[in-house]
Interface confidence: low
Amino acid sequence: GEGRKTWRRRGQQPAPAPLPPQRTEAAPGTGQPVESFPLDFTAVEGNMDSFMAQVKSLAQSLYPCSAQQLNEDLRLHLLLNTSVTCNDGSPAGYYLKESKGSRRWLLFLEGGWYCFSRENCDSRYDTMRRLMSSKDWPQTRTGTGILSSQPEENPYWWNANMVFIPYCSSDVWSGASSKSEKNEYVFMGALIIREVVQELLGRGLSGAKVLLLAGSSAGGTGVLLNVDRVAEQLEQLGYPAIQVRGLADSGWFLDNKQYRRTDCVDTVTCAPTEAIRRGIRYWNGMVPERCRSQFKEGEEWNCFLGYKVYPTLRCPVFVVQWLFDEAQLTADNAHLTGQPVQEGQWLYIQNLGHELRNTLKDVPASFAPACLSHEIIIRSHWTDVQVKGTSLPRALHCWDRSLHDSHKASKTPLKGCPIHLVDSCPWPHCNPSCPTIRDQFTGQEMNVAQFLMHMGFDVQTVAQQQGLEPSKLLGMLSSGS
């Protein structure tokens, strides 16, 4: 997001700057990669809370023995095939933390918008070079959120083999172009994924039971564009038993009408459909075959939209999307800047939540809180947000179980284990577990009612519209009902 929200509990230190990445040294005294404790429960029956308590107790009892050996870092591996590159021709790569006892592999695609012309790619290269080049990548990265190996931070898949694939192709992971006289930059997003998978087969992926391709923002869209292709690749290479699944976070965008129409000048104010239309040509972008066949030539941009590509996918995909996604609002020129908003903008924002909710109606595995935010799965406090009393790691666990049980004919959801979790309340932050909002001047936390009034929300008018007493409405907002 834009700095208004924080993801820390009271009293915690602010997270370090996301840019530029800082080099972190490997823990002293570790001569080789540290193995995780080799337990692997691909589907856990029974009470998850009790299971987690046992895991936590086990982890804590083992902790003193291995304190010297703990190493949370994922280590950089540049691709051996140096013809598969970032925009500037430097080799692409991935960060890996192996977990020898596990047959689960999590491959995470980083996000970071895109560029779609020589001009805005030049500008991106000047100001965000790490998103176009591997030249300054640090040797290690710390796994956070779903990439963490700590059961407390990652109750879902803490023991998996973790792979972070940095985004350096600026093409929403769709490009399949090579260096040419005409192009200053190359766009190889789809080829990078293919090559990473190829190289990981030699590092243990060949023995995997489940490969979860996850991603946030442009990486989330990248999941939708590439998940079937990864499954196909593994099948063709002789690994049909590896179950390929997708987890798309904050990459489910709408081609709705912009709040204020703007000319297509830069990456953000350009309507996403127009940017992608131009981008596909510039990147030589690839979309899933089954989706492409549904649209005529020149209309492939439709396949970048979750609600259009999702029905054509073969692999199971879990969709995570804030109902009031900041990237969507920015693209729609309706983002909240801290200034009071006009009534028209409020209605527009509410309507966005309504439209997004509609597109998720037929997505059985989804988690969509009514919050104003962007990205969640690699944030340290990704466990904090709940929809209808269920957290995201819990929903993912239920999804795993439903897939594990799917050979059984029954299509009914598992009792007490929901996987379709979409908020129904209509305002940004009407869910009380949304990430904390802080007043950007005082740093004070704000509750929902304070936030909405701060943004110019007219309690009287809205209460009238809803046929409620203003005090009743404020009470409802504060409690998140």
Partner: antibody, heavy 119, light 111 residues
């Protein structure tokens, strides 16, 4: 040590010309976009001109367009600013600064060189 | 061009207290999840020195007493607790698009 050192500042008459130089050391000069900025006596900071790492993008403040020319020699690690048709309002301390390429802020500044335009 | 309005123009703060300087942009300087607003300190006879980059990130070597916040159009530099050596001028600057522009500066005095 990362360092930028400007030179070439002088007293010059209105309408005259002057060339400022900036010598870089301690970092890979050819990797960075570079800027010239200035500060008139007792005034705030004003951006003058920008040149990208490979000299493909040049940009100037409106009041300096056509009068000032920014250039660089990556082999010699030098940045230059050729100023012509100088006016009294161009009197200032001129700084060269390195642009950080993960955000566009100025993370390294020179100590400045003084240009005085007066008859 | 994006105009940055810095306030107050001058500020008197007691030793050990909090100094808060604001900077408002005429247009949003946030894009793709990053806010392109930076803060500098300039002492007399010296070039400016970077304190905070991308709205809230502390430049290495700068004391943790300095912090930045904000997004979109409204940004704040906080200094707490203020020390004697902090008495000087502070500028905000954006790099969202060319041309980059600066605020007019805030002169901090310690009493």
């Amino acid at each position: 040590e990362v360092q930028l050192v400007e030179s070439g500042g002088d007293l010059v008459k209105p309408g005259g010309s002057l060339k400022l130089s900036c010598a870089a050391s301690g970092f890979t000069f050819s990797d960075y976009g570079m800027h010239w900025l200035r500060q008139a006596p007792e005034k705030g900071l004003e951006w003058v001109a920008y040149i990208s790492s490979g000299s493909t993008t040049l940009s100037y403040a409106n009041t300096m367009k056509g009068r000032f020319t920014i250039s660089r020699d990556n082999a010699k690690k030098t940045l230059s600013l050729q100023m012509t048709s100088l006016r009294s309002e161009d009197t200032a301390i001129y700084y060269c600064a390195r642009k950080n390429y993960n955000g566009g802020y100025f993370d390294v500044w020179g100590t400045g060189t003084t240009v005085t335009v007066s008859s | 061009d994006i105009v940055l309005t810095q306030s107050p123009a001058s500020l008197v703060v007691s030793l050990g207290q909090r100094a808060t300087i604001s900077c408002r942009a005429s247009k949003s300087v946030s894009e793709s999840g990053y806010s392109y607003m930076h803060w500098y300190q300039q002492k007399p006879g010296q070039p400016p020195k970077l304190l905070i980059y991308l709205a809230s990130n502390l430049e290495s070597g700068v004391p943790a007493r300095f912090s930045g916040s904000g997004s979109g159009t409204d940004f704040t530099l906080n200094i707490h607790p203020v020390e004697e050596g902090d008495a000087t001028t502070y500028y905000c600057q954006h790099s969202r698009v060319l041309p980059p522009t600066f605020g007019s500066g805030t002169k901090l005095e310690i009493k």
